[in-house]
Amino acid sequence: ARSEDRYRNPKGSACSRIWQSPRFIARKRGFTVKMHCYMNSASGNVSWLWKQEMDENPQQLKLEKGRMEESQNESLATLTIQGIRFEDNGIYFCQQKCNNTSEVYQGCGTELRVMGFSTLAQLKQRNTLKD
């Protein structure tokens, strides 16, 4: 069987599982971040969800005009957030809704941690934890 067949759902939908990357971002306040979702097919539009706390249900992300931007091509969807703020902290999920079925696939999430300006040593420590 072809590798992509393993990710088709049992009904044989053309919709694919999606891989979200990275799983964790730690970046400074005011900086720009990007997160991605890779798909086997472009058989559905991707939207983005966000939750602030682990035990919350993710909500549709309200894109802040001029600061947040989503883009999508054949197999890649990207969310770009510029000038990140502490209130952007949380977990971001991409979600693909199939065109030909009602099924919805969701990425595993990207946790964004907005940091204050700090020393390189502190940064390296955080990066070690992240890895």
Epitope: K28, R29, G30, T32, K34, Q82, F117, L120, L123
Partner: antibody
Framework: EVQLQESGAELVKPGASVKMSCKAS????????MHWVKQRPGQGLEWIGA????????GYNQKFKGKATLTVDTSSSTAYMHLSSLTSEDSAVYFC????????????WGQGTLVTVSA | DIVLTQSPASLAVSLGQRATISCKAS??????????MNWYQQKPGQPPKLLIY???NLESGIPARFSGSGSGTDFTLNIHPVEEEDAATYHC?????????FGGGTKLEIK
């Protein structure tokens, strides 16, 4: 027209402190970060720190923590930098400059404030 | 801190010729396909002036004879053809990691 107007030259004694200003005009003050940069005579440029006027969040170069304090007055669209415990090493030209996001480029600069520390 | 090493420290270029200035970073200044490297021109008694942002983008109002290239750790500013008014000191600056740092500057003289 975007302008960053800095305060005039200062001659101060060692151990004293100084507060310089940077008055912004021609744009929405709270939409851009304000950075401060030091240049000693005949030397390179050093980033001191930055402030987001929308909420007064500050980020400093560790080298200048305890030396520089950045503040803003949004009502007058003015950024301030206070330098304390001055020594001859602090004699320099200090520039204010703005960026749209915290880590984007510096597109407009003030003319600079010359600080001379001398007994 | 990210150290930016500019070379040469000074150069003299004949009118109409090409000036090439290099800036090497001690670590990558790229993030997600964007290079956080900027170039400024500074004349005596004046503040720096933005020429190139994000490695290769020409700032509005800057003549097209200025161009920037590079990614990762190696960046270049080119001026061609050089004009009399280009005599100045040129600084590279990274804004991918705080503290933001500048190169030591390159002084361009026109022959």
């Amino acid at each position: 027209e975007v302008q960053l107007q800095e305060s005039g030259a200062e001659l101060v004694k060692p151990g004293a402190s100084v507060k310089m200003s940077c008055k912004a005009s021609g744009y929405t003050f709270t939409s851009y970060w304000m950075h401060w940069v030091k240049q000693r005579p005949g030397q390179g440029l050093e980033w001191i720190g930055a402030i987001d006027p929308s909420d007064s969040y500050t980020g400093y170069n560790q080298k200048f923590k305890g030396k520089a304090t950045l503040t803003v007055d949004t009502s007058s669209s003015t950024a301030y930098m206070h330098l304390s415990s001055l020594t001859s090493e602090d004699s320099a030209v200090y520039f204010c400059t703005r960026s749209y996001y915290g880590n984007s480029w510096f597109d407009y600069w003030g003319q600079g404030t010359l600080v001379t520390v001398s007994a | 801190d990210i150290v930016l090493t500019q070379s040469p420290a000074s150069l003299a270029v004949s009118l109409g010729q090409r000036a090439t200035i290099s800036c090497k970073a001690s670590q990558s200044v790229d993030y997600e396909g964007d290079s956080y490297m900027n170039w400024y021109q500074q004349k005596p008694g004046q503040p720096p002036k933005l020429l190139i942002y994000a490695a290769s983008n020409l700032e509005s109002g800057i003549p097209a004879r200025f161009s920037g290239s590079g990614s990762g750790t190696d960046f270049t500013l080119n001026i061609h053809p050089v004009e009399e008014e280009d005599a100045a000191t040129y600084h590279c600056q990274q804004s991918n990691e705080d503290p933001f740092t500048f190169g030591g500057g390159t002084k361009l003289e026109i022959k």
